[in-house]
């Protein structure tokens, strides 16, 4: 607390501006305005990321207006230093007290590359495993000292479950953050809306994403399965193809089964849903099988899990490598 | 030119700075410093994108240092106005002359979202039409007054053909720019490298993308075509599926033919190439056909154009809706 017999200074940093095209000048001037204090000795220090700078400052002589004094100190920085996201502080010592203002380059106001996506639960998790989860995915973050916060809420105001978080540095140097939230099967089916809020020091505003059960018409998938004939040079391998089409909405899970056992997802490759010429969607799934498998049991099942399929949200089709045998 | 009997003013805009976290304050102050002029009447006007602003300016009283005078005028803007990328000008009229300085929000220094992609020619254009083109695509540009320049170069140093350019405003407000360059069939096949260079005032540095013929092993595609059986409720429509697989490299063109005529690309939907479990790639293509078509001629052809296919870079497979008839 300052004693009554002096008026403390106001410290405010101004900066040279970009030109009419928004381009940074080659050098940036920071002007520290120390104003409105009772005349007396003041000491001005510039800090870069908290460290005292060894600089030759152009500190203007103090001016006096009435009872109060003002001083200004100017710091010149290279464009490169300014753009490197360091924080600059003008620290004023006066009457045994410290007053300061800090600044850094304004965060990109439109960080286009930072994107957030919120998934719906997979039909398999929702209807078969009965443990649905939703995932909030944030991509193209520039790695920085600031923490990315992903917080969950429900439109109903009810509490959310405990979420799990994962961070991954991508090869292109960006950061990917995911948060996975378990949701109640009944809550989801009854139309609850879930919200994911993303905050980060470099984001000018929070990103909000919400997800809920898809509305609109429902249509069950048609499932067709085919086996490729033998191809020269690959007698011990065949490809099975499954076309799943005309379903609505687009959320679908595809599985392959052999010997009543579900094959690992890594075994098959399934395309993203695409629109048909009509109002529905389609996917293709491809599975490579070996002679050992078809000789053990020559029946493979392609199964689609979809909310409009009945009974029990599944439709399946069997296919054999050698159907005539 | 100013006459000799007065010293003209220097006009410079300073601005309030972002805080130590790089966040914009709720309001932004622009301070126009008009300094070093021979005392006399001056008039200060603020312009927004060239239009005079009807504002209540806090113009400080003029101060005098020795023979010369200085004046300052402050303009307060909402964060929203400042972030909307408008240009602000401080215009000073003095002794019948105009002096000014302009500023706007600094362009994002790390516009991560601006991406450039350079395609290879489609096998169809390369081997069938024999008029290959490559396209440089720039996405996620913020629309602005600056021009995006896309220029072409060849690694061999030889001249490039004339390119065609297209600009498209996307629904999300961003700009997409493409430049399409015709290339010589022989140049491409012999391994020429083409470079696309993207410059823009808001890009801190040029983006460079290059493309050349894919190196590595070659493998011709296997082509399989299937027809779906009749499905209840859709007697007059069938779906044809084509699986094209185990080809290398991934560049492929897929066409459907009926009655020896190539069907428009819009008629079918073909997936992007995906890796097989082995070293090759696969795609699926889906075509919906009508009873009128199959009754006219019940043979549909799925054709793949690929550099490793022989003869003449094509492999095709015929399929019928009712194969037994």
């Amino acid at each position: 607390v300052c004693s009554r017999d002096f008026t403390p200074p106001t410290v405010k940093i101004l900066q040279s501006s970009c030109d009419g095209g928004g381009h940074f000048p080659p050098t940036i001037q920071l002007l520290c305005l120390v104003s409105g204090y009772t005349p007396g000795t003041i000491n001005i220090t510039w800090l870069e990321d908290g460290q005292v700078m060894d600089v030759d400052l152009s500190t203007a002589s103090t001016t006096q207006e009435g009872e109060l004094a003002s001083t200004q100190s100017e710091l010149t920085l290279s464009q490169k230093h300014w753009l490197s996201d360091r924080t600059y502080t003008c620290q004023v010592t006066y009457q045994g007290h410290t007053f300061e203002d800090s600044t850094k380059k304004c965060a990109d106001s439109n960080p286009r590359g930072v994107s957030a996506y919120l998934s719906r639960p997979s039909p398999f998790d929702l209807f078969i495993r009965k443990s649905p989860t939703i995932t909030c995915l944030v991509v193209d973050l520039a790695p920085s000292k600031g923490t990315v916060n992903l917080t969950w809420s429900r439109a109903s105001g009810k509490p959310v479950n405990h979420s799990t978080r994962k961070e991954e540095k991508q090869r292109n140097g960006t950061l990917t953050v995911t948060s996975t939230l378990p949701v109640g099967t009944r809550d989801w089916i009854e139309g609850e809306t879930y919200q994911c809020r993303v905050t980060h020091p470099h984001l000018p505003r929070a990103l909000m994403r919400s997800t809920t059960k898809t509305s609109g018409p429902r249509a069950a998938p048609e499932v067709y399965a085919f086996a490729t004939p033998e191809w020269p040079g690959s007698r011990d391998k065949r490809t099975l193809a499954c076309l799943i089409q005309n379903f609505m909405p687009e959320d679908i899970s595809v599985q392959w089964l052999h010997n009543e056992v579900q094959l690992p997802d890594a075994r098959h490759s399934t395309t993203q849903p695409r629109k048909t010429k009509g109002s529905g969607f389609f996917v293709f799934s491809r599975l490579e099988v070996t002679r050992a498998e078809w000789e053990q049991k020559d029946e493979f099942i392609c199964r689609a899990v979809h909310e409009a399929a009945s009974p029990s949200q599944t439709v399946q089709r069997a296919v054999s490598v050698n159907p005539g045998k | 030119v100013c006459s000799r009997d007065f010293t003209p003013p220097t006009v410079k805009i300073l601005q309030s700075s972002c805080d130590g976290g790089g966040h914009f304050p709720p309001t932004i102050q622009l301070l126009c410093l008009v300094s070093g002029y021979t005392p006399g009447t001056i008039n200060i006007t603020w312009l927004e994108d060239g239009q005079v602003m009807d504002v209540d300016l806090s113009t400080a009283s003029t101060t005098q240092e020795g023979e010369l005078a200085s004046t300052q005028s402050e303009l307060t803007l909402s964060q929203k106005h400042w972030l909307s990328d408008r240009t602000y000008t401080c215009q000073v009229t003095y002794q019948g002359h105009t002096f000014e300085d302009s500023t706007k929000k600094c362009a994002d220094s790390n516009p991560r979202g601006v991406s450039a992609y350079l395609s290879r020619p489609s096998p169809f254009d390369l081997f069938i039409r024999k008029s290959p083109t490559i396209t440089c695509l720039v996405v996620d540009l913020a629309p602005s007054k600056g021009t995006v320049n896309l220029t072409w170069s060849r690694a061999s140093g030889k001249p490039v053909n004339h390119s065609t350019r297209k600009e498209e405003k996307q629904r999300n407000g961003t700009l997409t720019v493409t430049s399409t360059l015709p290339v010589g069939t022989r140049d491409w096949i012999e391994g020429e490298t083409y470079q696309c260079r993207v410059t823009h005032p808001h890009l801190p540095r040029a983006l460079m993308r290059s493309t050349t013929k894919t190196s590595g092993p070659r493998a011709a595609p296997e082509v399989y075509a299937f027809a779906t059986p009749e499905w209840p409720g859709s007697r007059d429509k069938r779906t044809l599926a084509c699986l094209i697989q185990n080809f290398m490299p991934e560049d492929i063109s897929v066409q459907w033919l009926h009655n020896e005529v190539q069907l428009p690309d819009a008629r079918h939907s073909t997936t992007q190439p995906r890796k097989t479990k082995g070293s090759g790639f696969f795609v699926f293509s889906r075509l919906e056909v009508t009873r009128a078509e199959w009754e006219q001629k019940d043979e549909f052809i799925c054709r793949a154009v690929h550099e490793a296919a022989s003869p003449s870079q094509t492999v095709q497979r015929a399929v019928s809706v009712n194969p037994g008839k």
Partner: antibody
């Protein structure tokens, strides 16, 4: 695939002459690119010497201009470096290279294995 | 001529280390938003191999542990996790203006 093979290096007396060859296979030197000579003195760094463009134009490092000539024989798909008035400081491994062009600028993308020139009495 | 100064001249490091080599040009090698700076790797008795072009573009086939950055006069080559095959001499080279010049080299040795 383009390959470059240098030859013609060896021991030469100060004041003497030498002609280095760079035989190119897999690409015609008149079809495109700039073709370079770069040298490296024993235990030292690299120095660009001279270049010949596919259109026949030539460039030289001022440090060697007047003593060195770059030329080519289209029929043999080979380019050469003729070195006269050789000095001890010309002792180096001489590399030939193919340069990649980018808007009037070039960098050295494909290199030969090098040939050693020793200038000594 | 544009002079290029590399630092350090040599360094000792272990497999897995992050290695940074800097190159300073006597004048800017940037034109129209492009940085005309390249990086080469040379192993004993072999020709140099181009790693990075235009300051930061990784040459096709070069492992992603190599990266280049910088602009104007100051450039950096970084090896994020040094591998046994990375022990070599590294050169920066400017192709902004004739005559094209190289740095004096940085030798990366096994600690």
């Amino acid at each position: 695939e383009v390959q470059l093979v240098e030859s013609g290096g060896g021991l030469v007396q100060p004041g003497g002459s030498l002609r280095l060859s760079c035989a190119v296979s897999g690409y015609s030197i008149t079809s495109g690119h700039r073709w370079e000579w770069i040298r490296q003195a024993p235990g030292k760094g690299l120095e660009w010497v001279a270049s010949i463009h596919y259109d026949g134009s030539t460039n030289y490092n001022p440090s060697v201009k007047g003593r060195i000539t770059i030329s080519r024989d289209d029929s043999k798909n080979t380019f050469y470096l003729q070195m006269n008035s050789l000095r001890a400081e010309d002792t180096a491994v001489y590399y030939c290279a193919r340069a990649t062009h980018y808007f009037g600028h070039h960098h050295f993308a494909v290199w030969g294995q090098g040939t050693l020139v020793t200038v000594s009495s | 001529d544009i002079q290029l100064t590399q630092s350090p001249s040599s360094l000792s490091a272990s497999v897995g280390d992050r290695v940074t080599i800097t190159c300073r040009a006597s004048q800017s090698v940037d034109y129209h938003g492009d940085s005309y700076m390249n990086w080469y790797q040379q192993k004993p008795g072999k020709a140099p191999k181009l790693l990075i072009e235009w300051g930061s573009y990784l040459r096709s086939g070069v492992p992603s542990r190599f990266s280049g950055s910088g602009s104007g006069t100051d450039f950096t080559l970084t090896i994020s996790s040094l591998q046994p095959e990375d022990f070599a001499t590294y050169y920066c080279q400017q192709n902004a203006e004739d005559p094209y010049t190289f740095g004096q080299g940085t030798k990366v040795e096994i600690k």
